[in-house]
């Protein structure tokens, strides 16, 4: 089997209206607190130069960064959504743990590094922005994986 055959999420993960709603409500709450509307983390730049078949691996990297470096530090905010969404995203992350790609992932690492640097440069407002884009993270995982 090709290595990226492990880069799959069951459709059922995205077919639970309650958790979809909570994820998107969390994104909305955070985006209302985000006043830096010119910067987009999950957008054209993130996918540039990355083949569609490798985008699930890309989004796995973004998901893990979001969980560890964004949602955990902000875990006391945006309740009650946060306490429901974090376990859901953690479950998706664990499903993707065997996901790897063969060959050159230089573009992927560059794009993920740029995203991380943008969040870190913006500080707390970068973390809020990343939470405000959880709807994009969700949709990108659904489409790519």
């Amino acid at each position: 089997l090709p290595i990226n055959s492990q880069c799959k999420l069951e459709a059922a993960n995205f077919q639970q209206p309650y958790i979809v709603n909570r994820t998107f409500m969390l994104a909305k709450e955070a985006s209302l607190a985000d006043n830096n509307t010119d910067v987009r983390l999950i957008g054209e730049e993130l996918f540039r130069g990355v083949k569609a078949k490798d985008q699930c691996y890309l989004m796995k990297q973004v998901l893990n960064f979001t969980l560890e470096d964004v949602l955990l530090p902000q875990s006391d905010r945006f309740q009650p959504y946060m306490q429901e969404v974090v376990p859901f995203l953690t479950k998706l992350s664990s499903h993707l743990s065997p996901c790897h790609i063969s060959g050159d992932d230089q573009n992927i690492q560059k794009n993920v590094r740029q995203l991380k640097e943008t969040v870190q440069k913006l500080g707390e407002s970068g973390e809020i922005k990343a939470i405000g884009e959880l709807d994009l993270l969700f949709m990108s995982l659904r489409n790519a994986c």
Epitope: G43, Q55, D135
Partner: antibody, heavy 121, light 111 residues
Framework: EVQLVESGGGVVRPGGSLRLSCAAS????????MNWVRQAPGKGLEWVSG????????DYAASVKGRFTISRDNAKNSLYLQMNSLRAEDTALYYC??????????????WGRGTLVTVSS | QAVLTQPSSVSGSPGQSITISCTGA?????????VSWYQQHPGKTPKLIIY???KRPSGVSNRFSGSKSGNTASLTISGLQAEDESDYYC??????????FGGGTKVTVLG
């Protein structure tokens, strides 16, 4: 140059079926999500259906769910829309549309010229 | 089916700025980052002019700009020109993963 060419439209009776095709060229087809959008004569745009890069995720407007099926053949660079149980209100120009960038099919940056479907008795 | 509400028509004189609003329920424009705008001249194919709320595709004039506040997205056309006379549609992804278009706004350039 990105090109999308729709075909398969025509006149069909209520309750009948049609299969629309969209031939894509000028880009790596399997890197992009694709959509069907329709426009009834003199009316606004209505999204019909969308599919992700590998056909694993398919979504439909409520008005066509259960009657229409979207599919793609990446080996043939083609997108399809199987339309069953057609109604008069399905009469429209049907456009094939590609996502503006890979990873976001909902931003429809490239459109075909459309193929006309007329449902009439 | 969710609905995005746009004014049916907006007009302005050459050189003026106009803004077209696109309002949805909290499950539509307000909850998502997926808003796009399309221009369609009579008898022509739609053209993407704004994506991802406020990004402009290459080749689209910088007189077009997009923004979003709460449940309302907006398209602003500054320095209005005769060729801007057209129909404009907003669109957004919604919670059942479908895409919804607004009803369209006819822009008229006066004089």
């Amino acid at each position: 140059e990105v090109q999308l060419v729709e075909s398969g439209g025509g006149v069909v009776r209520p309750g009948g079926s049609l299969r629309l095709s969209c031939a894509a060229s000028g880009f790596t087809f399997d890197d992009y999500g694709m959509n069907w959008v329709r426009q009834a004569p003199g009316k606004g745009l209505e999204w019909v259906s969308g599919v992700n890069w590998n056909g694993g995720t398919r979504d439909y407007a409520a008005s066509v769910k259960g009657r229409f099926t979207i599919s793609r053949d990446n080996a043939k660079n083609s997108l399809y829309l199987q339309m069953n149980s057609l109604r008069a209100e399905d009469t429209a120009l049907y456009y094939c549309a590609r996502g503006w960038y890979s990873g976001a099919a909902w931003n429809m940056g490239y459109w075909g010229r459309g193929t006309l479907v007329t449902v009439s008795s | 089916q969710a609905v995005l509400t746009q004014p049916s028509s907006v007009s302005g004189s050459p050189g003026q700025s106009i803004t077209i609003s696109c309002t949805g329920a909290s499950g539509d424009v307000g909850a998502y980052n997926f808003v796009s705008w399309y221009q369609q001249h009579p008898g022509k194919t739609p053209k993407l002019i704004i994506y991802d709320v406020n990004k402009r595709p290459s080749g689209v004039s910088n007189r077009f700009s997009g923004s979003k506040s709460g449940n309302t997205a907006s398209l602003t056309i500054s320095g209005l020109q005769a060729e801007d006379e057209s129909d404009y549609y907003c669109a957004s992804l919604v919670s059942d993963f479908s895409v919804v278009f607004g009803g369209g706004t006819k822009v008229t350039v006066l004089g």
